[in-house]
């Protein structure tokens, strides 16, 4: 198949809520109106698919209803947000692009994203 | 019309550090991807790296690897080069080029030169 | 890493003549990463060929390109004053992007 450069931030750190927000930018090489998007999780050798979601260029980015992911799509980035990520969700993420429509099929990997999240301290005991 | 003006060459001793920039203008900076390229005195032309649009990703050639940054302001509409741990072997034009694969644009290029 | 190596390295040439640069692959690019430009001393490099056949903008139509695999041309299809300078190609994909050594376009 033919590939294409993807981009995206090497480390993203959660917030305390446990939601991660990176960029993930593709280099079309030809005028693709169909794209997929793919988040894989990278841990200790496994690759996991985290969500993924299929767009036309111009419309917004639709996940299933039960997907930790949201993401708005501009051109040829995707803003891509993960929620609900605890301390054990620390990991590489990876966006996988497919330009799907109209041929050829072009797929880009990017280096994935190490996302860090760390567990909030539960608030202490209070008499107040 | 589009211009790639690359500025911040000169004479920098071995060991030393570089940042060039190059300022853009004549088109929408932040929708492209852009490129250092660099030539050495008499002989041909070596990728250094390029950076994504937003700025969020960058990719190195591996002898570059650990020793450079790409970065951009896209509020500026400038692009820079870091370059650490000079050698002479460093002593080159520097060219930032624009375009994902094929650069339709490129800067008149800036000299550095390693030496002491 | 993708080796691109041209021939022939330098060639002479007189003004009308048909002249043709090979750049080899070390293994297979898409046409759609190969490229081709023109140097003329002190000056940047300037883009005549993209997806190996494509004529960039303001380009003459002398100037055409073919191959695909591992195999590309670039022709000149009647050398003027103004094309003596050196060629290169580059692959823009896998990273990282290559070049390669460039062919020099003297006059006979």
């Known amino acids: 198949c033919k590939a294409m450069h993807v981009a995206q931030p090497a480390v993203v750190l959660a917030s305390s809520r446990g939601i991660a927000s990176f960029v993930c930018e593709y280099a079309s090489p030809g005028k693709a109106t169909e794209v997929r998007v793919t988040v894989l999780r990278q841990a200790d050798s496994q690759v996991t698919e985290v969500c993924a979601a299929t767009y036309m260029m111009g419309n917004e980015l639709t996940f299933l209803d039960d997907s930790i992911c949201t993401g708005t799509s501009s051109g040829n980035q995707v803003n891509l947000t993960i929620q609900g990520l605890r301390a054990m969700d620390t990991g590489l993420y990876i966006c996988k692009v497919e330009l799907m429509y109209p041929p050829p099929y072009y797929l880009g990997i990017g280096n994935g994203t190490q996302i860090y999240v760390i567990d909030p301290e539960p608030c202490p005991d209070s008499d107040f | 019309e589009v211009q790639l003006v690359e500025s911040g060459g000169g004479l920098v001793q071995p060991g030393g550090s570089l940042r060039l920039s190059c300022a853009a203008s004549?088109?929408?900076?932040?929708?492209?991807?852009i490129h250092w390229v660099r030539q050495a005195p008499g002989k041909g032309l070596e990728w250094i790296g390029w950076?994504?649009?937003?700025?969020?990703?960058?990719k190195y050639a591996q002898k570059f690897q650990g020793r450079v940054t790409i970065s951009r302001d896209n509020s500026k509409n400038t692009l820079y080069l870091q370059l650490n741990s000079l050698r002479a072997e460093d002593t080159a034009v520097y060219y930032c080029a624009r375009g994902a694969y094929e650069f339709d644009y490129w800067g008149q290029g800036t000299l550095v030169t390693v030496s002491s | 890493d993708i080796q691109l190596t041209q021939s022939p390295s330098s060639l002479s040439a007189s003004v009308g003549d048909r002249v043709t640069i090979t750049c080899r692959a070390s293994q297979s690019v898409s046409s759609r990463f190969l490229a081709w430009y023109q140097q003329k001393p002190g000056k940047a490099p300037k883009l005549l060929i993209y997806d190996a056949s494509n004529r960039a903008t303001g380009i003459p139509s002398r100037f055409s390109g073919s191959g695909s695999g591992t195999d590309f041309t670039l022709t000149i299809s009647s050398l003027q004053p103004e094309d003596f300078a050196t060629y290169y190609c580059q692959q823009s994909y896998p990273t990282p992007l290559t070049f390669g050594q460039g062919t020099k376009v003297e006059i006979k």
């Open positions: 950076i994504s649009p937003s700025g969020g990703g960058t």
């Open positions: 004549g088109f929408t900076f932040s929708d492209y991807w």
